[in-house]
């Protein structure tokens, strides 16, 4: 698995160089996560037809996996940095159940799905600090997630290779349209 | 055990009708998707006509859409396939299918868990 941002070389190596604002420190980190979604994918498209054949294969998806919606205020139209930091923030906590779910499910990729799982841990805690409405998050029930979990394990093996294959898109479109929104904070 | 029974198959003329049923046995479908497909003698087993266990949402392959209508009596525990129009490309044997968990739909046989023993549908020109 890559390095985790900050943990390279050259960090170590110059230590003159001016320490990383908190917005630099998510955009990295987001980048990072995306870079380990990629090599995921990667596996899951090598070891399966998923990825050209979903659309044609898929008649009705109840993932409820996250999504940017106009209401959110992440898009250029209707911006609200508020909301769509609540919104960005609220939506990776309801992503972990899903992360969760990818670990076990790769093989030469296990470390690396380890990592985007706990990179994405850390995303969370930077952004919570940076929010200023953090009563208005509200954190996924652990007996929902715990069934939800359940379930997404107890399909057979081909809905087991869609679902990973519409989490890691629908994780990849995600975080795109998060990194595009908290660039322009 | 899990069980699914199919039957109303037959002999039919071209244009007429056949309403298959499905019973399933040894748990309960209501959330789970279940669906028709059918395999022509030579052919590959094809995806017919699927119904959504949470939504009710139908779904037809092209080549039955306006003819064939897919219903589920949860109650019964039951799928109907009503076949009107019948042509004699429809001759196969059709197999009801169910999957257990329900957070996916699709029309692709690998995508579900249980499997009736066939009907066969013969039409005769």
């Known amino acids: 698995a890559p390095v985790p941002p900050g943990e390279d070389s050259k960090d170590v190596a110059a230590p003159h160089r001016q320490p990383l604002t908190s917005s630099e420190r998510i955009d990295k980190q987001i980048r990072y996560i995306l870079d380990g979604i990629s090599a995921l994918r990667k596996e899951t498209c090598n070891k399966s037809n998923m990825c050209e054949s979903s659309k044609e294969a898929l008649a009705e998806n109840n993932l409820n996996l996250p999504k940017m919606a106009e209401k959110d205020g992440c898009f250029q139209s209707g911006f609200n940095e508020e909301t769509c930091l609540v919104k960005i923030i609220t939506g990776l906590l309801e992503f972990e159940v899903y992360l969760e779910y990818l670990q076990n499910r790769f093989e030469s990729s296990e470390e690396q799905a380890r990592a985007v799982q706990m990179s994405t841990k850390v995303l969370i805690q930077f952004l919570q600090k940076k929010a200023k409405n953090l009563d208005a998050i509200t954190t996924p029930d652990p007996t929902t997630n715990a069934s939800l979990l359940t379930k997404l394990q107890a399909q057979n093996q081909w809905l087991q290779d869609m679902t990973t294959h519409l989490i890691l898109r629908s994780f990849k479109e995600f975080l795109q349209s998060s990194l595009r929104a908290l660039r322009q904070m | 055990a899990v069980q699914l029974v199919d039957s109303g198959g037959g002999l039919v003329q071209a244009g007429g009708s056949l309403r298959l049923s499905c019973a399933a046995s040894g748990r309960t479908f209501s959330s789970s998707p279940m669906g028709w497909f059918r395999q022509a003698p030579g052919k590959e087993r094809e995806f017919v006509a699927a119904?959504?266990?949470?939504?009710?949402?139908?779904y037809y392959a092209d080549s039955v859409k306006g003819r064939f209508t897919i219903s589920r009596d949860n109650a019964k525990n039951t799928v109907y396939l009503q076949m009107n129009s019948l042509k004699p490309e429809d001759t196969a044997v059709y197999y009801c299918?169910?999957?257990?968990?329900?957070?996916?739909?699709?029309?692709?046989?690998?995508?579900?868990?249980?499997w009736g023993q066939g009907t066969q549908v013969t039409v005769s020109s």
């Open positions: 299918a169910a999957e257990r968990v329900g957070l996916l739909l699709t029309v692709v046989a690998e995508g579900y868990d249980y």
């Open positions: 119904i959504s266990g949470r939504s009710g949402n139908t």
